[in-house]
């Protein structure tokens, strides 16, 4: 009789996670009598996957009925494949004995598991940044196999080029993870902008996975301040308005000071949104000119999103035409747009630094 050969026709088999893998093995002879065993790996640490003669292997079924007369087909089917099942599987013929004696092994079949990447998760910076600054966004996806994967970044549909990507581990593994960091330069118009991380993998059949992050979580657009003043009214009162324009996010506190003394503090809330996602807010103050002997220095102090206060000051002239209606000379905008000192204390009540 011809010498027994154990034939594993496929050098490699690729299976999607969750599916079944068929590992083929045939013997060329009925002789010698003895069982087939399947192992993953070689050497003393090899893992028994299936034993024709004994044991319980719930995920493994022989393709051919082992009781079939003259059976020489020792192929097996492994159900519900996971990335942990990847490896090289050997069909090994044993000679009947006490114990059975290993006789001949097949050449091995490498099982690779195609596992889909997890949905990409995009995370932005921990603190907000202002326009013209660069912020980093990170995209992570896990659990995919094989290792080859493509990751792209987009901002408002435009592909980004400033990013760095790593796939781990570098060596062989049952599954892999990808982490990419993109650098994005912010502009004042980015409140409604979005960054997208797009992951393409062989398991996705050309339908990439996307993760998104809104730049609204990462950006701060500081306000512009503007004063306007209406003509003095008959009752010697002047209506002064402080316009706070084009800011984001909405968290803002405005304090009026008359000659350095706090007159009123207000918090912005439920403001309508501009088309670009920013907000405007107008606050007004009635100044009773007759109550002052000297010019009144008005300060509109704005604390935006926990940042150091921005001041805009304005002088209301008391001396000129105190009772003349419609006069434009009763007040004067000094044009100072001061940013408060950045080393002020948190417990300075004037700044209400922790109001949200």
């Amino acid at each position: 009789e011809e010498e027994l050969q154990v034939i594993q026709p496929e050098k490699s088999v690729s299976v999607a996670a969750g599916e079944s893998a068929t590992l083929n093995c045939t013997a060329t002879s009925l002789i010698p009598v003895g069982p087939i065993q399947w192992f993953r790996g070689v050497g003393p640490g090899r893992e028994l996957i299936y034993h024709q003669k004994e044991g319980h292997f719930p995920r493994v079924t022989p393709v051919s009925d082992p009781t079939k007369r003259n059976n020489m087909d020792f192929s097996i089917r492994i159900s519900n494949i996971t990335p942990a099942d990847a490896g090289t599987y050997y069909c090994v013929k044993f000679r009947k004995g006490s114990p059975d004696v290993e006789l001949k092994s097949g050449a091995g079949t490498e099982l690779s598991v195609r596992a889909k990447p997890s949905a990409p998760v995009v995370s932005g910076p921990a603190v907000r940044a202002t326009a013209e600054h660069t912020v980093s966004f990170t995209c992570e996806s896990h659990g995919f196999s094989p290792r080859d994967i493509t990751l792209k970044w987009f901002k408002n549909g435009n592909e980004l080029s400033d990013f760095q990507t790593n796939v781990d581990p570098a060596g062989k593994s049952v599954s892999y993870s990808i982490r990419s960091t993109a650098r994005v330069v912010l502009t004042r118009r980015d409140v409604h902008s979005q960054v997208i991380c797009e992951v393409a993998h062989v398991t996705l059949q050309g339908d990439p996975l996307r993760g998104t992050a809104n730049l609204s979580e990462a950006i701060r657009v500081p306000p512009f301040l503007e004063f306007t003043q209406q003509s003095m009214r008959a009752d010697n009162q002047v209506n002064v308005t402080c316009q706070v324009m084009k800011f984001y996010p909405q968290r803002l506190q405005l304090t009026w000071l008359e000659n350095g003394n706090v007159s009123r503090t207000e918090m912005a809330s439920a403001l309508p949104e501009n088309k670009d996602g920013t907000y405007n807010w107008t606050s007004w103050l009635l100044v009773n000119v007759s109550a002052h002997r000297d010019d009144v220095k008005l300060t509109c102090q704005v604390e935006h999103d926990g940042q150091p206060a921005v001041n805009k000051s304005f002088s209301v002239k008391v001396s000129a035409h105190p009772k003349e209606q419609g006069s434009n000379t009763a007040a004067e905008n000094t044009g100072t747009n001061e940013r408060g000192s950045s080393d002020y204390k948190d417990d300075d009540d004037k700044h209400h630094h922790h109001h949200h």
């Epitope: 009925l30 009598v33 003895g34 024709q52 003669k53 004994e54 009781t67 003259n70 059976n71």
Partner: antibody, heavy 119, light 110 residues
């Protein structure tokens, strides 16, 4: 190691039935055929039938078609052979044997059950 | 059915000599290059024991003094040199179709 355990003796009345058991251990019961063989005192071996425990497929020697019925209980890894309408000609040692190579041969044998049919 | 005829029915062989037992089938028991003949040894009060499978292959643990040969319809079991423990009855069996046994050959050691 492969073991097939059979009771030593069965004493039965003529015309009655007897159910012989063969409890398998040391291997995957459903992966190998079980054969039954008769041997009358001082006589040769007669093949009765075989059963595949995985699906209870059976093959019978035509001589024993109306005499023997093979069954298995997979939960207890036990094969059974029921002999009916017993006569003195059924007095014999009955062996179960396992076909290890799926060649319709008998690689491992039980020690046999001696059946005596007597009134 | 295939009928197996064994000869002789009994034989006596001196210790250390050769014992030859024949098994003839009523039709060929060969298929796909294999000869479906098996040889068993049975000692009194014991179940049979498989010696040789597929005409010429020694089963696990069987001494090399046992050998099998033949093809088609004619098969032979040889024991050389015969030892005292070889005293037993020897049966051939075929499985070309459903199994049948030969009538047996009783070996005595002189």
């Amino acid at each position: 190691q492969v073991q097939l355990q059979q009771p030593g003796t069965e004493l039965v009345r003529p015309g009655a039935s007897v159910k012989l058991s063969c409890k398998a251990s040391g291997y995957t019961f459903t992966n190998y055929w079980i054969n039954w063989v008769k041997q009358r005192p001082g006589q040769g071996l007669e093949w009765i039938a075989m059963i595949d425990p995985s699906d209870s497929e059976t093959h019978y020697n035509q001589i024993f078609k109306d005499k023997a019925t093979l069954t298995v209980d997979k939960s207890s890894n036990t094969a059974y052979m029921q002999l009916s309408s017993l006569t003195s000609g059924d007095s014999a040692v009955y062996y179960c044997a396992m076909d290890y190579g799926s060649l319709y041969a008998m690689d491992y044998w039980g020690r046999g059950t001696s059946v005596t049919v007597s009134s | 059915d295939i009928v197996l005829t064994q000869s002789p029915a009994s034989l006596a062989v001196s210790l250390g000599q050769r014992a030859t037992i024949s098994c003839r089938a009523s039709k060929s028991v060969s298929s796909s290059g294999y000869n479906y003949i098996f040889w068993y040894q049975q000692k009194p009060g014991q179940p049979p024991k498989l010696l040789i499978y597929l005409a010429s292959n020694l089963d696990s643990g069987v001494p090399a003094r046992f050998s099998g040969s033949g093809s088609g319809t004619d098969f032979t079991l040889n024991i050389h040199p015969v030892e005292e423990e070889d005293a037993a009855t020897y049966y051939c069996q075929h499985s070309r179709e459903l199994p049948t046994f030969g009538g047996g050959t009783k070996l005595e050691i002189k």
